[in-house]
Interface confidence: low
């Protein structure tokens, strides 16, 4: 609930068409100069001039400035080769990845094509190129990881081995692997690589799965992490969502020798819905443990106007997954629902990760947010972020790919990048978020005796507000202006309380508080009071009065100044006033009139 | 069977008057909070009203207050809602939902009904 659409920092490619924002990463550079970056790939971007070239693809890296156009072209030079290799329409920038703050950046590019000659016959195979780049997103000879060759396909099979493996389609890194997707190896039937460093020594890893048959997609997305099936070894999932025609998801653990080893697939329900084309792993209820998430974003229910889902996989203490989603979230028809999906960190402050899923197609594309909780994924979104009302001409698609996790404007709170497939990126970033820490609403008396009131005093109310900002950020003492409604009696009309000084049992009020506030009010008894049995109840609710500008602006403005509630708290409180009843000291009568009857003579004896 | 079912949707005129209920059944009711959202065709889930246990204190989305009134009956194990002057614009699926909190996040909720149709047109 607290991502902010209203102050926006939005990159526009320059050429459109580039597909800009296919692919999108937040990066931390440390190296050379301090700064935030908002890398976006642009697969479809013309080439770097060279006079034989089209179009490569490109990498930008985008500032954190309120400019739409000052991003820069990452440089990584391929030279045009056509008797060796093809960098017409590779795609470079299909992946985009960070490792982290002060962490390397990787690029990969899955139509980069060798070119292999029998004789004067020339043979293309698409094996893909991923390349590693420095902190700074420049090359550094001297680091391993960048002058690794990466190549883990072997362009000198055909299209049944390693020669069309497409690799890069997907990747990333952790702290000591970088790995790969290449769904076109064996077939299409895909496969996943995995380099490993341990101090100077380096391990290939690479799974081939057993079964005899092309198109499952192996690869096509793939997440790598620890506290899965082990609390220390790394498990690798991977996303195949023509497996069987209904898609699975595989997760694979190391084995001696570079194999990687089959663990357990989770299979999809539903033929074509393309489960495991995107995926996210995420500690959801807090026991230690990464849950996963699946995005199927074709899977539809014609009835129930259902289009896309996640399913919500909770982890069972590293021992296996169950079979079966604990979770299945739906989008509307045709809006592919879960064709991205993200872990964006703990957004709101809360002590539970969130998570953000695309529905790209749904009007001009939609991200929703959901926040977790000891018992998982909370089933409704609490935050629907709508592409159509960020005002930003040409926009479509918006969710078409996310990136979260890092808190990019040191407000403490984690901030989301949303690319899109119509040359746009939108950081959203997230507004401090104000707990209510203490709230109470005391009545004096609490039983009500009419006798006792006076023309000045009858019913004094008390209310008090604490706050505290939800963030581990100590700082934040601002002074916050709280608006508050009291109302008497809000069922009943006439109202038997109204307020001193008004006729109204209303009484609208405001505390601008760094600390503790109190206020008091009086209540006087209206006249001509009836009803003396059912207890008053007085009403109180809240809300921060902010001025957010009308409509999005772009701008880096600093959102301290604009907190937001917690929306997961009730922002309502009441209270009761009892009448004096004098009904015992709880002061409830609870009737419990008895009759007996009996015959009895004049002189009162019994009858038999 | 812990459930919520929601009756009483129908076609009706502006101006009319109708009342849905939620009869719940598997779990005490009156340990609960509970309330009606609604969700009109391409738009989200809305608030719509929630009253607490006791039914002594309710809450309502503005564009609904002072036209519907929800109410509980612990006994039976029903709340109503209860809409009057009704327009088009409250045309939707109305679900009866249950939490622990009085609030207006759909989050907050944890079972639902499967709904009622509810259509205002002339």
């Known amino acids: 609930f607290n991502l902010d659409t209203r102050f926006l920092v939005v990159k526009e490619a320059g050429n459109p068409g580039s597909l800009f924002g296919y692919s999108v990463a937040l990066h931390r550079q440390t190296e050379r100069q301090q700064r935030y970056l908002l890398l976006a790939g642009a697969p479809r971007e013309l080439a770097v001039p060279d006079g034989y070239t089209n179009r490569t693809g490109a990498v930008y890296l985008c500032p954190l400035t309120a400019h739409k156009d000052d991003c820069e072209r990452m440089n990584i030079t391929v030279k045009n080769d056509p008797g060796h290799h093809i960098i017409e329409d590779m795609w470079l920038g299909v992946t985009v990845a960070s490792q982290g703050p002060a962490g390397r950046v990787l690029v990969c590019a899955h139509r980069y094509t060798q070119v292999l000659w029998s004789g004067s016959e020339d043979q293309r195979r698409m094996v893909g190129k991923c390349y590693v780049r420095g902190n700074d997103l420049e090359l550094d000879s001297s680091d391993d990881w960048q002058t690794y060759h990466n190549e883990m396909c072997n362009s000198n099979t055909d299209y049944l081995e390693t020669g069309m493996c497409q690799l890069g389609t997907s990747g990333g890194f952790t702290q000591n692997t970088v790995y790969f997707g290449a769904p076109g190896a064996y077939n299409w039937k895909g496969n996943s690589y995995m380099i490993q460093r341990k101090e100077w020594d380096l391990s290939e890893y690479s799974y081939k799965d057993p079964e005899d048959q092309g198109n499952l997609y192996i690869g096509y997305t793939m997440q790598v992490g620890s506290f899965i099936l082990h609390p220390k070894n790394i498990t690798i999932v991977t996303g195949a969502p023509r497996h069987r025609h209904m898609g699975a998801v595989f997760l694979l653990s190391q084995e001696a020798g570079g194999d990687l080893r089959r663990r357990q697939v989770l299979e999809g329900s539903q033929v074509g819905a393309y489960f495991g084309s995107a995926i996210a792993l995420a500690d959801l209820n807090n026991d230690g443990w990464q849950d996963l998430l699946v995005g199927a974003p074709y899977y539809f229910e014609r009835k129930e106007e259902v289009g896309g889902a996640i399913y919500v996989f909770m982890n069972q203490a590293g021992t296996s997954f169950p079979a079966h989603p604990s979770l299945l979230l739906h989008g509307p028809s045709g809006s592919a629902f879960g064709l991205s999906v993200a872990s964006i960190g703990d957004i709101n402050q809360d002590g539970f990760q969130d998570i953000a899923v695309g529905a790209p197609f749904e009007g001009l594309g939609k991200v929703y947010i959901y926040h977790s909780s000891s018992k998982g994924l909370l089933r409704q979104p609490q935050q629907v972020i709508h592409g159509e009302k960020l005002g930003l001409p040409g926009l479509a698609t918006f969710g078409y790919s996310l990136s979260g996790q890092m808190d990019v404007d040191e407000n403490f709170y984690p901030d989301l990048l949303v690319g899109s497939l119509s040359d746009h990126i939108v950081l959203l970033r997230a507004r401090p978020v104000i707990n209510i820490v203490h709230k109470t609403l005391v009545p004096r008396p609490a039983v009500l005796d009419p006798a006792l009131c006076t023309a000045t005093s009858c019913v004094q109310v008390e209310l008090c507000f604490a706050y505290n900002q939800s963030a581990g950020n100590p700082n934040y003492r601002r002074n916050i202006t709280l608006a508050y409604t009291l109302e008497a009696d809000r069922d009943r009309r006439p109202p038997r309380l109204r307020f001193a000084g008004s006729e109204s049992a209303v009484f609208h009020g405001f505390f601008s508080m760094p600390e503790m506030r109190c206020q008091k009010l009086e209540l006087l008894l209206m006249d001509n009071l009836r009803d003396k049995l059912r207890p008053i109840i007085i009403s109180m609710n809240y809300s921060l009065p902010l001025r957010m500008p009308d409509r999005p602006r772009l701008g880096l403005r600093s959102l301290d100044a604009y907190p937001i509630l917690n929306q997961a708290q009730a922002l309502e409180n009441h209270t009761e006033v009892q009448f004096q009843k004098e009904c015992g000291p709880d002061n409830k009568c609870e009737s419990n009139l008895q009759m007996r009857a009996a015959f009895v003579s004049e002189q009162q004896q019994k009858l038999s | 069977e812990v459930q919520l079912v929601d009756s009483g949707g129908r076609l009706v005129q502006p101006g009319d008057l109708l009342r849905l209920s939620c009869t719940t059944s598997g779990f005490a009711s009156s340990g609960y909070v509970l309330g009606w959202f609604r969700q009109a065709p391409g738009k989200e889930r809305e608030f719509v009203a929630a009253?607490?246990?006791?039914?002594?204190?309710?809450a309502y989305s503005d564009s609904v207050k002072g036209r519907f009134t929800i109410s509980r009956d612990n006994a039976k194990n029903t709340v109503y809602l209860q809409m009057k002057s009704l327009k088009p614009e409250d045309t939707g699926i109305y679900y009866c939902?249950?939490?622990?909190?009085?609030?207006?996040?759909?989050?907050?909720?944890?079972?639902w009904g499967q709904g009622t149709q509810v259509t205002v047109s002339s």
């Open positions: 939902a249950r939490s622990s909190v009085l609030g207006r996040s759909p989050a907050l909720y944890d079972l």
């Open positions: 009253i607490i246990r006791s039914g002594g204190n309710t």
